[in-house]
């Protein structure tokens, strides 16, 4: 009786169970009464990442520098190339097909999480006691200066965008 189902890493064709080609190889000829499946390695800049019966390998992804991309991990015959973005840029999607400039946190906001090649800057509002007076992709909110530790007094209260202004204490004459 011809088989109706095949084992793992096999496929059914012409009433026969043929071995799939291993990752990194493509199918040339199905197995026959006389021969095992014929597979060939993928060429330069090609890959197949699963046990397969594909007659063509996939092209490695191209990391286009015009889109701000660069190679993070070179592809092999079994894996695709992984792209990431140039310094100061991050991917617009999980597939990382293009890049955008990292966002800066405006005054009054600080960097909660610095951007990576795949994620944008995460900003947070500066809470009471902290400030940021610059637009930056790196600066966190800074704590207000502690006038007391300098034996000074607050002359002007701080905001989320400005530091406190310290001044000398009034002396009793």
């Amino acid at each position: 009786e011809p088989p109706t189902a095949c084992r793992e890493k096999q496929y059914l064709i012409n009433s026969q169970c043929c071995s799939l080609c291993q990752p990194g190889q493509k199918l040339v000829s199905d197995c026959t009464e006389f021969t095992e499946t014929e597979c060939l390695p993928c060429g330069e800049s090609e890959f197949l990442d699963t046990w397969n019966r594909e007659t063509h390998c996939h092209q490695h992804k191209y990391c286009d520098p015009n889109l701000g991309l660069r190679v993070q991990q070179k592809g092999t015959s079994e894996t695709d190339t992984i792209c990431t973005c140039e310094e100061g840029w991050h991917c617009t999607s999980e597939a990382c097909e293009s890049c955008v400039l990292h966002r800066s946190c405006s005054p009054g906001f600080g960097v909660k999480q610095i951007a990576t090649g795949v994620s944008d800057t995460i900003c947070e509002p500066c809470p009471v006691g902290f400030f940021s007076n610059v637009s930056s992709a790196f600066e966190k909110c800074h704590p207000w200066t502690s006038c007391e530790t300098k034996d000074l007094v607050v002359q002007q209260a701080g905001t989320n965008k400005t530091d406190v202004v310290c001044g000398p204490q009034d002396r009793l004459r």
């Epitope: 012409n14 071995s19 040339v28 000829s29 199905d30 026959t32 009464e33 006389f34 021969t35 095992e36 014929e38 060939l40």
Partner: antibody
């Protein structure tokens, strides 16, 4: 439908080179393998060698030093070249597809002066 | 090379009677992927060989069910349950597990 046809000279002189062509139809040589077999008159079958779909070859070690098998996929042809012929190379030469039961009709090659 | 040894050399059979041909290989014909590429052919005078059985026991399409194959490793058998006049010719076993592929010397079946 699938067909294979051998062609070449019926008579070759000793020490010369035999050139045979197997012309196929009904399938592509890039997807199927073809092998050559010969049968001396009144004797058994001898496997000569094989051209795989991917372009690699396997040869019978007893003939390897004298044998070349090649293919032209665009012309649907597999070629056999066997050099330094002797009378022992007299045989019917068949080309065969490596699946099912597809044989050429065979061509008799006689090596004689 | 794998040597394929067939016996008997000649097999006279009465029509309607069974027949059995043995084929031994000089080493195992089991492939690395678990297949055993042992085949049986019948060649009639003036014709090219015709495939009867492939991979030990699989009847090729159009082959009558009176033909059956069995065996494993190095010992294989072709059986004809009831011989008919049209079954005459030379039977060859063949292996395609190892390069070079090789054939047995042949068994000539004739009608008594």
């Amino acid at each position: 439908q699938v067909q294979l046809q051998e062609s070449g000279p019926g008579l070759v002189k000793p020490s010369q080179t035999l050139s045979l062509t197997c012309t196929v139809s009904g399938f592509s040589l890039s997807r199927y393998s073809v092998y050559w077999v010969r049968q001396p008159p009144g004797k058994g079958l001898e496997w000569i060698g094989m051209m795989w779909g991917g372009g690699s070859t396997d040869y019978n070690p007893s003939l390897k030093s004298r044998l070349t098998i090649s293919k032209d996929t665009s012309k649907s042809q597999v070629s056999l070249k066997l050099s330094s012929l002797t009378a022992a190379d007299t045989a019917v030469y068949y080309c065969v597809r490596t699946d099912g039961d597809y044989w050429g009709q065979g061509t008799l090659v006689t090596v004689s002066s | 090379d794998i040597v394929m040894t067939q016996s008997p050399l000649s097999l006279p059979v009465t029509p309607g009677q069974p027949a059995s041909i043995s084929c031994r290989s000089s080493q195992s014909l089991a492939s690395s992927q678990g297949n055993t590429y042992l085949h049986w052919y019948l060649q009639k005078p003036g014709q090219s060989p015709r495939l009867l059985i492939y991979k030990v026991s699989n009847r090729f399409s159009g082959v009558p069910d009176r033909f059956s194959g069995s065996g494993s490793g190095t010992d294989f058998t072709l059986k004809i349950s009831r011989v008919e006049a049209e079954d005459v010719g030379v039977y060859y076993c063949s292996q395609s597990t190892h390069v070079p592929w090789t054939f047995g010397g042949g068994t000539k079946l004739e009608i008594k």
